[in-house]
């Protein structure tokens, strides 16, 4: 597999440092290549674990830049995929350079949940909206999904009040607290003047990958009135 | 196992024709024995399948009659048991005579269900009471029992009306129709003067053994009045 | 009476399994099945029991005198345990046929281990709604 | 992160199961598990899968370099699949250890066949009441 792609012993150098980065389920392959007198073009192929006839599938063909978005080639984000890149200069092709095994769910990053905070009677209601990811151009939430093991299993919610911080945990599979759009957390408020500041992060099932932490949102309670 | 029970070559004849009969879960062992100048006594032993340390257990010791009630030695009536009988004359013992494999549920007989019949509005209600059996001295119904595969799975109910007979089937596991005491069947009645005669039999799960058929009970409908 | 009963009695004769010494040293399956009432626990145990019988029947596949009995029993097992569902039976058979000494099978098994483990606990009993637009489908 | 994850990644290195050729010829278990949503169907399949892993681990019991990983994973399997219930695990292990070529085991299996078959279909889903005084208890 590390031999030449087509022709005999090749004078075309192999791409180096093939890496994959993923943000919100959008994996992009990067590689490096030495400066050549003639402009090289690259072909990127992807192989997925768990596809019936697992073969190397073309993701980008004869491109000149050094990256390739392979999000259309991701099946179950818990499954592994591998990438290989070859260079072509004129009629000659290099050997393939291969990536390490990559699993979008294990090795990628997920953006933060969005937060909303409001006062209702004697409690503060916190809405935690599941992070949105773009899959095949569709915006979707990283909600519990019986079809994959890649979903946010728990939210860590950090509540600061007058300097002291309490951490709450919300299990996303508990239907009382969560639906496919958001989770809710109710916090009783004391009657004192207090500022409540809240941030949250999700923890993905299996690999325990943590999403980015949300920006802190605050609410101030004056006796029983509210100042956002 | 067919050798002598204690002493050397025995001149004491072996019992013959060891058979088991069971009615309403009460198995009794019978055997035959030749006439002897000295009165013989018999020991009956039982071995059950499914008992942890399966050994021959004494059921009747040194009895002079030719039968032995072994109902205290029945575990799950679906499980097999075997019986062996030896004779003793004075100090000498015979070899054991052994029964065939016997399963109370497969090889025994069960008495009939009891029936009750009455008219309610525009239908006849038939109550089918599960046959009673005596297990370890306790009266119990042959109701569906998740602890054993030996229970009445279905009742065949035969309804005769003016010469023609219809057969109904009642599944005992359907809670709408049955409980631990009885099953119920509702039959719509025509407005004509008619006599309805009903009998029923149970069919046991697995071996499909049929209980005895109940006596026929009848009810006569005059327009909308009843004569039992 | 289900068709398997007569054929199983026939097999008992063939294997001399109606003799009293068969009772020695307890039961194989019946005692274990008595321990588990919960349907999913029963299926865990029955899965092993059924695969044992299929292996046993395979060992006697060349014995013509019991072929009809074996086929009838297998058929009834497929009806009762697999609900006559050929796909369920085929998937089950694939699993029972994997060779634990095959290097490629070993590597695949280890590769899949994390995801298999992640699914071992029963799914949350919430009857959790399924999104109309499912996530992460490739 | 559950303890098994790190140890399973360790096993992947040991078995070279992270290389792309491991993807050839489809999945062993994951594809099958995707087919079955119903909890009892999943248990039928998972029962076979778990017994496969236990056999695989047994084959490598003398390999000291992966013993800690294997033990951690087995422990986590016991927690997840057997709900930390030792009796369940023991019954399961008994079933997986019966030898299909042992004559006494064969005879017992055939003796028990009728009753095993009678219990194969799921119990009536009625939540049927259980009598206080159970029938036929020996």
């Amino acid at each position: 597999e590390m031999g030449t792609a087509d022709l005999g012993p090749s004078s075309v150098p192999t791409p180096t440092n093939v890496t994959i980065e993923s943000y919100n389920m959008n994996p992009i392959v990067y590689w490096e290549y030495q400066i050549m007198p003639q402009v090289p073009v690259f072909t990127v192929e992807v192989k997925n674990y768990g596809v019936k006839n697992s073969e190397w599938i073309d993701a980008c063909i004869n491109i000149s830049h050094h990256y390739c978005n392979i999000s259309d080639h991701v099946g179950d984000p818990s499954n592994s995929l591998w990438v290989r890149v070859k260079a072509r200069v004129g009629q000659k092709e290099s050997a393939y350079a291969k990536s390490e095994e990559f699993a979008v769910c294990r090795d990628g990053k997920i953006g933060p949940p969005k937060l909303d905070i409001r006062k209702e009677e004697k409690q503060i209601m916190i809405d935690i909206f599941h992070p949105s990811v773009f899959v095949n151009g569709d915006e979707q939430e990283v909600d519990y999904d019986p079809e994959t093991t890649c979903y946010i299993r728990v939210y860590n919610v950090y509540v600061r009040m007058n300097g002291s911080e309490i951490q709450y945990k919300i299990l996303t599979q508990k239907e009382d607290d969560c639906d496919e759009i958001q989770c809710q957390l109710a916090i009783p408020v004391s009657s004192l003047n207090s500022q409540y500041c809240v941030s949250a992060e999700g923890v993905l099932h299996v690999w325990g990958v943590t999403t980015e932490k949300s920006k802190e949102v605050c609410i101030t309670i004056f006796n029983s009135s509210i100042k956002g | 196992e067919m050798g002598t029970a204690d002493l050397g070559p025995s001149s004491v004849p072996t019992p013959t024709n060891v058979t088991i009969e069971s009615y309403n879960m009460n198995p009794i062992v019978y055997w035959e024995y030749q006439i002897m100048p000295q009165v013989p006594v018999f020991t009956v032993e039982v071995k059950n399948y499914g008992v942890k340390n399966s050994e021959w257990i004494d059921a009747c010791i040194n009895i002079s009659h030719h039968y032995c009630n072994i109902s205290d030695h029945v575990g799950d009536p679906s499980n097999s048991l075997w019986v062996r009988v030896k004779a003793r004359v004075g100090q000498k013992e015979s070899a054991y005579a052994k029964s065939e494999e016997f399963a109370v549920c497969r090889d025994g007989k069960i008495g009939p269900p009891k029936l009750d019949i009455r008219k309610e509005e525009k239908q006849i209600m038939i109550d089918i009471f599960h046959p009673s059996v005596f297990v370890n001295g306790d009266e119990q119904e042959v109701d569906y029992d998740p602890e054993t595969t030996c229970y009445i799975r279905v009742y065949n109910v035969y309804v005769r009306m003016n010469g023609s007979e219809i057969q109904y089937k009642i599944l005992t596991q359907k809670e709408d129709d049955c409980d631990e005491i009885q099953c119920q069947l509702a039959i719509p009645v025509s407005s004509l003067n008619s006599q309805y005669c009903v009998s029923a039999e149970g069919v046991l799960h697995v071996w499909g053994v049929t209980t005895e058929k109940s006596k026929e009970v009848c009810i006569t409908i005059f327009n909308s009045s009843i004569k039992g | 009476q289900d068709p398997y009963v007569k054929e199983a009695e026939n097999l008992k004769k063939y294997f001399n399994a109606g003799h009293s010494d068969v009772a020695d040293n307890g039961t194989l399956f019946l005692g274990i099945l008595k321990n588990w009432k919960e349907e999913s626990d029963r299926k865990i145990m029955q899965s092993q029991i059924v695969s044992f019988y299929f292996k046993l029947f395979k060992n006697f596949k060349d014995d013509q005198s019991i072929q009809k009995s074996v086929e009838t029993i297998k058929e009834d097992m497929n009806v009762k345990f697999f609900n006559s569902n050929k796909k369920k039976r085929d998937d089950f058979e694939k699993l029972t046929n994997y060779s634990v000494t095959d290097l490629n099978v070993q590597r695949k098994a280890i590769h899949e281990l994390i995801q298999v483990m992640a699914e071992l606990s029963p799914a949350a009993k919430t009857g959790k709604r399924k999104r109309s637009q499912m996530l992460f489908r490739g | 992160q559950d303890p098994y994850v790190k140890e399973a990644e360790n096993l992947k290195k040991y078995f070279n199961a992270g290389h792309s050729d491991v993807a050839d010829n489809g999945t062993l278990f994951l594809g099958i598990l995707k087919n079955w949503k119903e909890e009892s169907d999943r248990k039928i399949m998972q029962s076979q899968i778990v017994s496969f892993y236990f056999k695989l681990f047994k084959n490598f019991k003398d390999d000291q370099s992966i013993q800690k990983s294997v033990e951690t994973i087995k422990e986590d399997m016991n927690v997840k699949f057997f709900n930390s219930n030792k009796k369940k695990r023991d019954d399961f292990e008994k079933l997986t250890n019966y030898s299909v070529t042992d004559l006494n085991v064969q005879r017992k299996a055939i003796h028990e066949l009728i009753q095993v078959m009678a219990e194969l279909s799921p119990a009536a889903k009625t939540g049927k009441r259980k009598r206080s005084q159970m029938l036929f208890r020996g």
């Epitope: - | - | 609900n83 006559s84 569902n85 050929k86 | 079955w36 949503k37």
Partner: antibody
Framework: EVQLLESGGGLVQPGGSLRLSCAAS????????MSWVRQAPGKGLEWVSA????????YYADSVKGRFTISRDNSKNTLYLQMNSLRAEDTAVYYC????????????????WGQGTLVTVSS | NFMLTQPHSVSESPGKTVTISCTRS????????VQWYQQRPGSSPTTVIY?????PSGVPDRFSGSIDSSSNSASLTISGLKTEDEADYYC??????????FGGGTKLTVLG
């Protein structure tokens, strides 16, 4: 080559009866489950009835249960469908079909199909 | 009982690829095999895909079948369309309680 040849169709009045036959050749008839599938004029396919290879198990669609009876004679390699209490909505081409996979006692998929026989129920 | 829903009709030009879907109304599409039958006008049905994705011998590899659990549907894909592919296509599955269900059928028109 596997061949299935249906016969016995025709015009019958509502409430009447008809018996369809399907003569099979080119395979071990008793090893395969068999089925009847029908197709009303201009409409889709509807499974009607099935029978196991031995003939011991039979299955019916709700729409024909109690009126139709499937049977087979393995010595004659023939499948039958006895149709009683016929209704206008039973009008269709009736196909006999062999199970596509042997050794599975309920049909699993249908292959091949016969050429069909037309049953018309009309007064 | 579940239903299998197919589009009434699809059309595409020769040489192109067409996909016909078959959506199961309840229960999992993956838990029983799905078959696909082709019925040309005036002829009996013939199998083009069995057991989700298997092709009988004699059926060209332009025909492929797949299952998508997320949409609870099966698909028949025909690539390199030819005029002879013009026909009605039916999906079929078993319902787990001794009934065999067919989809309503899809009329494929090859344009031109």
């Amino acid at each position: 080559e596997v061949q299935l040849l249906e016969s016995g169709g025709g015009l019958v009045q509502p409430g009447g009866s008809l018996r369809l036959s399907c003569a099979a050749s080119g395979f071990t008839f008793s090893s395969y489950a068999m089925s009847w599938v029908r197709q009303a004029p201009g409409k889709g396919l509807e499974w009607v009835s099935a029978i196991s290879g031995s003939g011991g198990s039979t299955y019916y669609a709700d729409s024909v249960k109690g009126r139709f009876t499937i049977s087979r004679d393995n010595s004659k390699n023939t499948l039958y469908l006895q149709m009683n209490s016929l209704r206008a909505e039973d009008t269709a081409v009736y196909y006999c079909a062999k199970d596509g996979s042997s050794g599975w006692y309920v049909p699993h998929w249908f292959d091949p199909w016969g050429q069909g026989t037309l049953v018309t129920v009309s007064s | 009982n579940f239903m299998l829903t197919q589009p009434h009709s699809v059309s595409e030009s020769p040489g192109k690829t067409v996909t016909i879907s078959c959506t199961r109304s309840s229960g999992s599409i993956a838990s029983n095999y799905v078959q696909w039958y082709q019925q040309r006008p005036g002829s009996s049905p013939t199998t083009v895909i069995y057991e989700d994705n298997q092709r009988p011998s004699g059926v060209p590899d332009r025909f492929s079948g797949s299952i998508d659990s997320s949409s609870n549907s099966a698909s028949l894909t025909i690539s390199g369309l030819k005029t002879e592919d013009e026909a009605d296509y039916y999906c079929q599955s078993y319902d787990g309680s001794n009934r065999w269900m067919f989809g309503g059928g899809t009329k494929l028109t090859v344009l031109g």
